[in-house]
Structures are given as structure tokens and as C-alpha cells.
């Protein structure tokens, strides 16, 4: 069980020792469902900068390099935890907050809704 | 600037009011780079359960439903913040920790390095 209010050390421990977090940095361009990354900044939040993925196309890129609208580019979303200053501008009091971020895009077969 | 140790209220505020976090729940199956979700549980971490995506195939699914090895399924990874009990089993003392999670998979044109 977790108590309501806890002490948190902000000196981050990075467990990504065996992996290269930059590894997927070029996928946004090489994917069949490419995306752009948009900077979302909020000084009241920790981390203050979060990058949001936005799919470039409604369809997916085919072998000829053209957009194929028989397929759909869709964002892969994940709920992440951030710290929000509470009350606002507070130097050392925060509240956990859950936000939904788009991490990248994937190409899916569309769900066809038949229009009568 | 952020101090080293702060007070955090664990009563989570969910800002995902206008979205349905389950919306992308079937993409793992409909994607041309489908993935399986594996449960990663750690009682010393908050959140204690994290879902890891593992791409099903080395290649991507083509229009015929077959795996095309001229394309690659790759994991989209994201660094996220979690709380780690410190010292271990501590009821109300935590440290911020950065971990790398695979959120889903996307289909990319390969960088040919070592495949003959």
C-alpha cells in the first residue's frame, strides 16, 4: 500500500544502462507511419519538457513512397506519471499527475464502417 | 529549479478527461508491426505494474497477411519516470527513477548493416 503523501528524492536514478535511449530517434522518419515531434513545455510540471508525436499522414507510406489511404497512421499513446507543483509555484510540494502522451505512430488496417 | 527532496501527494490527478486511454488498445493486433503486451510487476516501484510491448515479428505484415522481411518491426521506446522505494521497502520515502519502456511497434524501412 502507498501512503497519501511521501518524500521523493529528485536525484534521478537512470536504469537504462544497457540500452541506448536514442536508438529509436530516427524511426519517426523511417516509419511507414512517420510522425513529427512537438515540444510541450510546462514549468509547473516535472519533467517540464515532454515531446508529443503527431502522425504526418492519415494513411501510411507504401513501397513507392506514396501515401496509401487504405491504411491508417495512428498514434501509440501511453499514460505516464509526472509531478505537478501544488499549490502552483510551490518550490517543494507536488502532486502526482497522470497524462496521456503520444509516443510515436504505427500503421493499422482500418476499421471499415459501412455507410448505408 | 527543483530541490533535491520534495513532498509528493500520491492522490493522482488524471488529466486524461477528454480522451479514452483504451482507444488504442486494439492497435497491437491491427498494426502492420503487431506486438504482444507483457506485464512487468515490481512491488518496490510506483506504478508497480508496467506493460511492455514486444514486436511479434522481425518483419512487417504485408497486404496479403504475410511477414515481409524487406521491412522491420521495431519497438517505439520512451523514457518514463517512476517512483522507487528508497531505502527498499520504505513506506513513505521514494526516489525518482527513469526507465525505458517499449510502448508499441512501428514498421520501418531497414538500415541494411549486416544482413547479406
Amino acid at each position: 500500500n502507498f501512503p497519501r503523501t511521501v518524500m521523493v528524492n529528485l536525484n534521478i536514478h537512470n536504469r537504462n544502462t544497457n540500452t541506448n535511449p536514442k536508438r529509436s530517434s530516427d524511426y519517426y522518419d523511417r516509419s511507414t507511419s512517420p510522425w513529427n515531434l512537438h515540444r510541450n513545455e510546462d514549468p509547473e510540471r516535472y519533467p517540464s519538457v515532454i515531446w508529443e508525436a503527431k502522425c504526418r499522414h492519415l494513411g501510411c507510406i507504401n513501397a513507392d513512397g506514396n501515401v496509401d489511404y487504405h491504411m491508417n497512421s495512428v498514434p501509440i499513446q501511453q499514460e505516464i506519471l509526472v509531478l505537478r507543483r501544488e499549490p502552483p509555484h510551490s518550490p517543494n510540494s507536488f502532486r502526482l499527475e497522470k497524462i496521456l502522451v503520444s509516443v510515436g505512430c504505427t500503421c493499422v488496417t482500418p476499421i471499415v464502417h459501412h455507410v448505408a | 529549479n527543483f530541490p533535491r527532496t520534495v513532498m509528493v501527494n500520491l492522490n493522482i490527478h488524471n488529466r486524461n478527461t477528454n480522451t479514452n486511454p483504451k482507444r488504442s488498445s486494439d492497435y497491437y493486433d491491427r498494426s502492420t508491426s503487431p506486438w504482444n503486451l507483457h506485464r512487468n510487476e515490481d512491488p518496490e516501484r510506483y506504478p508497480s505494474v508496467i506493460w511492455e510491448a514486444k514486436c511479434r515479428h522481425l518483419g512487417c505484415i504485408n497486404a496479403d497477411g504475410n511477414v515481409d522481411y524487406h521491412m522491420n518491426s521495431v519497438p517505439i521506446q520512451q523514457e518514463i519516470l517512476v517512483l522507487r522505494r528508497e531505502p527498499p521497502h520504505s513506506p513513505n520515502s521514494f526516489r525518482l527513477e527513469k526507465i525505458l519502456v517499449s510502448v508499441g511497434c512501428t514498421c520501418v524501412t531497414p538500415i541494411v548493416h549486416h544482413v547479406a
Epitope: 540500452t19 529509436s24 | 511492455e52 514486444k54 522481425l58 522491420n72 518491426s73 521495431v74 519497438p75 520501418v108
Partner: nanobody
Amino acid sequence: QVQLVESGGGLVQAGGSLRLSCAASGLTASSYAMGWFRQAPGKEREFVAAISWISGGTKYADSVKGRFTMSRDNAKKQVYLEMNSLKPEDTAVYYCNDMPYGLDTRMDEYAYWGQGTQVTVSS
């Protein structure tokens, strides 16, 4: 830290067969494929074969297609390379490794390699 132990190499005559094994421990949650690689004297390490842990789907280098077969045992976290119709040009040290990005994993991203197992094919 990923630990890799390769075994099963040896000296064999051209046309013969060998079965290599690789035991992997400490794989990360993001691991979804394993690969076999080889390095002949004076040459760069090259890709031989890969297998998906989940689907069992495989990919082979053109030079070994139809002769080599890769398989895996998820429970034991082991992968195997069945090598038939061996040729002198297959002589090399054979290594296995985790492929966290599948076929897209680059050689320069490997922080760790096992000792490998020597395969020598005599004519």
C-alpha cells in the same frame, strides 16, 4: 547485464553438420529477437540468422539459406543453430546475441559479446 554462452562448435568435414546452442540470461524486457553472427579470421563480424522469441519467425543471410536452421526454446531461454551441408567458407567463430530491435539492431550497438564457439570446416 546480458550473459551469453555459446557451445557446440568443432571441427567437421565439408558437407557435415553441427548444432550450436546459445544460453541467454539477463535479457531485457524489450528483447524480442535473438541472432547468430559469425566472424572469420581477418573479416568483419556478419549476420547469420535471427529468430523472434514470440512468433518463432526466422531470417537468414543469403549465404546460409536452405542449409542453416535457427530455433528457440522460450522456457530455457536458449536458441539453436542447426548447420547442414557445411562449407569451408563457414569456418568462423560463431556468436549469439540479443536483438532488441530485431533486424534493425546495429552491430555497433552491442555492448557485450560472449566468447563464441569455433566452427572449422575442412575440405
